[in-house]
Interface confidence: medium
């Protein structure tokens, strides 16, 4: 399955929207910085696109979940958030279309399940952090910057796999 060109463009738009969503400077939130332990190795050890697609799907689904909560709606600009949802939704559709075409429909390798679990745990850490920080503006800014970084890393892996085909 070959993801459409628009998927690549959608990834860049998602990053642009995340950048536009910034409300305060990260420099004013230095005391709130946190290492969420993004499982980068889980994106680096998937050698076939068939293995990366479910992991990338999980990543985008979790971002969608994170930013579609009531607390998130209160934190961000509604227009930007709507555009953000649209881009994420389109990317989920692209990835799901690949799964339907037969990529990853065979029995899921344990390694892939472990990778999906690692992504879920990463987002659990982010959610817990937000709760502990009482969804403060600085906490959301730290999370926004973190999602930009991790999303960029994960989509870059996906692009590199495509370029090797």
């Amino acid at each position: 399955c070959d993801l459409p060109q628009t998927h690549s463009l959608g990834s860049r738009r998602t990053l642009m929207l995340l950048a536009q969503m910034r409300r305060i400077s990260l420099f004013s939130c230095l005391k709130d910085r946190h290492d969420f332990g993004f499982p980068q190795e889980e994106f680096g050890n998937q050698f076939q696109k068939a293995e990366t697609i479910p992991v990338l799907h999980e990543m985008i689904q979790q971002i969608f979940n994170l930013f579609s909560t009531k607390d998130s709606s209160a934190a961000w600009d509604e227009t930007l958030l709507d555009k953000f949802y649209t881009e994420l939704y389109q990317q989920l559709n692209d990835l799901e279309a690949c799964v339907i075409q037969g990529v990853g429909v065979t029995e899921t390798p344990l390694m892939k399940e472990d990778s999906i679990l690692a992504v879920r745990k990463y987002f659990q850490r982010i959610t817990l952090y937000l709760k502990e920080k009482k969804y403060s503006p600085c906490a959301w800014e730290v999370v926004r910057a973190e999602i930009m970084r991790s999303f960029s890393l994960s989509t870059n892996l996906q692009e590199s796999l495509r370029s090797k085909e």
Partner: antibody, heavy 119, light 108 residues
Framework: QVQLVQSGAEVKKPGASVKVSCKAS????????MHWVRQAPGQGLEWMGE????????IYAQKFQGRVTMTRDTSTSTVYMELSSLRSEDTAVYYC????????????WGQGTLVTVSS | EIVLTQSPATLSLSPGERATLSCSAG???????LYWYQQKPGQAPRLLIY???NLASGIPARFSGSGSGTDFTLTISSLEPEDFAVYYC?????????FGQGTKLEIK
Amino acid sequence: QVQLVQSGAEVKKPGASVKVSCKASGYTFTNYWMHWVRQAPGQGLEWMGEINPSHGRTIYAQKFQGRVTMTRDTSTSTVYMELSSLRSEDTAVYYCARGGLGPAWFAYWGQGTLVTVSS
Amino acid sequence: EIVLTQSPATLSLSPGERATLSCSAGSSVDSSYLYWYQQKPGQAPRLLIYSTSNLASGIPARFSGSGSGTDFTLTISSLEPEDFAVYYCHQWSSYPFTFGQGTKLEIK
């Protein structure tokens, strides 16, 4: 500061190929897609395609598919655009332009390379 | 392919006057991905406006952009001698990315 320096002017015969280079400096080369845009004499701008220098992934405009090849050399922070089966209507100034997000999109351009196709 | 049509093709005005340049898209363009560039003879294009209405770095406040959907406008409130050039609208809302054919702003 960000700089994109392109190779010099070329004169080619119809049917030949041309390879234009664009050397980037002043930023992390692998962090931004690089685009190629051309402009025929007295005409408007035309997007040809783009390359991700991080891993070489390319996306070409349908019009140039099969005739254009974009490559990169990360060791020298240089991208290349090769156009084959040249015809007279390919006579143009070819620009490289750096992609980015928001205000960074096409904020930096090479100086342009004139390619003349003539028999 | 989204076709961008600019009007007028040529605009003749005097310094100090107000310039209004139009860009009409063949199909809807997300305003976040509509940009304007200025080009002078022998030079590469220069970014003026990004995301329909945002001024690029170093661009004077006399330049402004507006619009949505299929109709976009670049306005120069009071023309300076250095503003006479060709102006292009550009979209990266969908592939292939396209430019308008340009509007030449000339001194009357």
